[in-house]
Amino acid sequence: FERTRSLQDPCSNCPAGTFCDNNRNQICSPCPPNSFSSAGGQRTCDICRQCKGVFRTRKECSSTSNAECDCTPGFHCLGAGCSMCEQDCKQGQELTKKGCKDCCFGTFNDQKRGICRPWTNCSLDGKSVLVNGTKERDVVCGPSPADLSPGASSVTPPAPAREPGHSPQ
């Protein structure tokens, strides 16, 4: 079957890294510089991706595979195949339309990317706040207030807990 197919379509013999050149009686020609073909039987080669500006070359383009980019330090990749580079912020911040802004009271971000998220509401799980939240860290929930009543357990009770989400600024 392969032999029959190749007799019908000489281009099917052209391997990756080449293209079937219609201008030269369908001879397999190597991809020109800065282009590639990742599969056989292609009639054109694709232009290599160029990593410019904040995009850095992670893998050079070859005749059979496209270049791959990542982001320069201070930026991180977004999208499939690192189609975008987004500026980092500090922990405790988020990137807004007006730049890196501190998380609002009651929210936190423990990464250099992404958005500020609300502190965990310990009381929803019937627990109390063991460690207060900050811009950079979520609250830590402790045992439920009932667990802290005298004689309820032999565990030493923690310091008196503040209201959920309370953080001294």
């Epitope: 410019k52 975008m84 580079c85 990137l95 807004t96 730049g99």
Partner: nanobody, 122 residues
């Protein structure tokens, strides 16, 4: 072919001013958002400023009230007026298209100029 050519860089004393220009060709400039970035050996790349096609402007905090981005659609040129320059503004300044319209974000389809060196020193 898209081309962005920056000019106007140079050596300036602290407190001085410079006006960078970026001449654009090969695309519909008037409907394109544009941006400026800078690169320093120490800090790497930094998003500096952007301007939408409607003239809305955006700045990173460190240059607010000192730098002004503007555009002249008749000349296919975007400008960065830099006043009260500080030694920490020393960098290579790049002009780039800004297709994402998002602060601090560029896409792989954006185009970049070759950059112009700005040195602030006494």
């Amino acid at each position: 072919e898209v081309q962005l050519v920056e000019s106007g860089g140079g050596l300036v004393q602290p407190g001085g001013s410079l006006r960078l220009s970026c001449a654009a060709s090969g695309f519909t400039f008037s409907s394109s958002a544009m941006s400026w970035a800078r690169q320093t050996p120490g800090k790497g790349f930094e998003w500096v400023s952007g301007i939408y096609s409607d003239g809305s402007t955006y700045y990173t905090d460190s240059v607010k009230d000192r730098f002004t981005i503007s555009r002249d659609n008749a000349k296919n040129t975007v400008y960065l007026q830099m006043n009260s320059l500080k030694p920490e503004d020393t960098a290579v300044y790049y002009c780039a298209t800004w297709g994402t319209l998002r602060f601090g974000v560029w896409a792989e389809y954006d185009h970049w100029g070759q950059g112009t060196q700005v040195t602030v020193s006494s």
